[in-house]
Amino acid sequence: QQQTLPKPFIWAEPHFMVPKEKQVTICCQGNYGAVEYQLHFEGSLFAVDRPKPPERINKVQFYIPDMNSRMAGQYSCIYRVGELWSEPSNLLDLVVTEMYDTPTLSVHPGPEVISGEKVTFYCRLDTATSMFLLLKEGRSSHVQRGYGKVQAEFPLGPVTTAHRGTYRCFGSYNNHAWSFPSEPVKLLVTGDIENTSLAPEDPTFPADTWGTYLLTTETGLQKDHALWDHTAQNLLR
């Protein structure tokens, strides 16, 4: 006899990286027939929702109107059908951004390199942080962590045309509180014609559309909540 129901999916809309004072909705999708959903934050009960017809009962939304550092952290949800509870969802790491200062991102030897050259990004922030994050814009949201007192190095090694794209960095005050994003650095990798034509390239965005990027980078993933979960987890672990 089944003792628990399958775990629900959890995700954040429009994104799990939320600028401070902006709104975010945490979504929890369970099964039809669910009569109660519970959202847990850092292991404690945070909110309860009990949908009734004609509300769709397989998915609920928990709205956070004003994101701040106290709301940032790890969320999970569970649901109940009759007396039977589900397994808990995967953990959703909700990150508050635009905290305190703005780091500076630079690249060595420069933003235009030849395929095979060694490239290193440097992220610098003169305030109290020791962890830095480098993100390549685009649907895949590639993330690297780096450490240093005021600056972190991100060696990419010998680059290929697949490394082309726009990069930004954050200073991280803790796992769930990040600085403003740096100004973008666009890395242009030139190679022979055959390599260039076949190389994948993430979409890039102008410097003033970081907000748009946050809204759009995961849109393809929102249709696949398992992949969304996986991406969110890997970003912070």
Epitope: Y32, K52, P53, P54, E55, R56, Q61
Partner: antibody
Framework: QVQLQESGPGLVKPSQTLSLTCTVS?????????WNWIRQPPGKGLEWIGY???????NYNPSLKNRVTISRDTSKNQFSLKLSSVTAADTAVYYC??????????WGQGTLVTVSS | DIQMTQSPSSLSASVGDRVTITCKAS??????LSWFQQKPGKAPKSLIY???RLVDGVPSRFSGSGSGTDYTLTISSLQPEDFATYYC?????????FGGGTKLEIK
């Protein structure tokens, strides 16, 4: 885009059974949501009659005194209303409607059924 | 059955006005309340559910509030297309019951 269309006779004699069908296009009635019948007597307010859910379960308004049945034909993507022993008080515009918040609802255009001999 | 009493039954207002319609339930309905708009000769359309949540695609000038037995629909700045009749619906208990309606007319 989901569309609903009511069909059935516009005139029913007292004591007979009113039968209406709602044909749904653009959305499967078994995939989600609640498929309702709602009526509105001329110049008056709305009254909920009942629904059949995506899974086939029913809820009815008991004020209709067990005169109401809502069923479905999944092969035709239709759901139907039967209201027995009608009187003049059952004269109304009858709407079929899909409700499933937070999604925007969808309604038929409504069909006027007059109960008269 | 839960009785839903709407007020006022009719209301005159001008484009740009802020308008408030209220609905009172005969018992606590735990915020399981929706609001509908109906134009003459047309089917109703949902605006708000769970007392204060906007149905997908509904303009943000519509908002809902309230708890317990008392609920309010507010239109922050009336547009010409907002002149219609508004109904509340409780779905906390079966049978679902509508309020009697509020007719919003042009002043």
């Amino acid at each position: 885009q989901v569309q609903l269309q009511e069909s059935g006779p516009g005139l029913v004699k007292p004591s007979q059974t009113l039968s209406l069908t709602c044909t749904v296009s653009g959305y499967s009635i078994t995939s989600d949501d609640y498929w309702n019948w709602i009526r509105q007597p001329p110049g008056k307010g709305l009254e909920w009659i009942g629904y059949i859910s995506y899974e086939g379960s029913n809820n009815y308004n008991p004020s209709l005194k067990n005169r109401v049945t809502i069923s479905r034909d999944t092969s035709k993507n239709q759901f139907s209303l039967k209201l027995s022993s009608v009187t003049a008080a059952d004269t109304a515009v009858y709407y079929c409607a899909r409700l499933g918040y937070p999604a925007m609802d969808a309604w038929g255009q409504g069909t006027l059924v007059t109960v008269s001999s | 059955d839960i009785q839903m009493t709407q007020s006022p039954s009719s209301l005159s207002a001008s484009v740009g006005d802020r308008v408030t319609i209220t609905c009172k339930a005969s018992q606590d309905i735990n915020s399981y309340l929706s609001w509908f708009q109906q134009k003459p000769g047309k089917a109703p359309k949902s605006l708000i559910y769970r007392a204060n949540r906007l149905v997908d695609g509904v303009p943000s000038r519509f908002s809902g509030s309230g708890s317990g037995t008392d609920y309010t629909l507010t239109i922050s700045s009336l547009q010409p297309e907002d002149f219609a009749t508004y109904y509340c619906l409780q779905y906390d208990e079966f049978p679902w019951t509508f309020g009697g309606g509020t007719k919003l007319e042009i002043k």
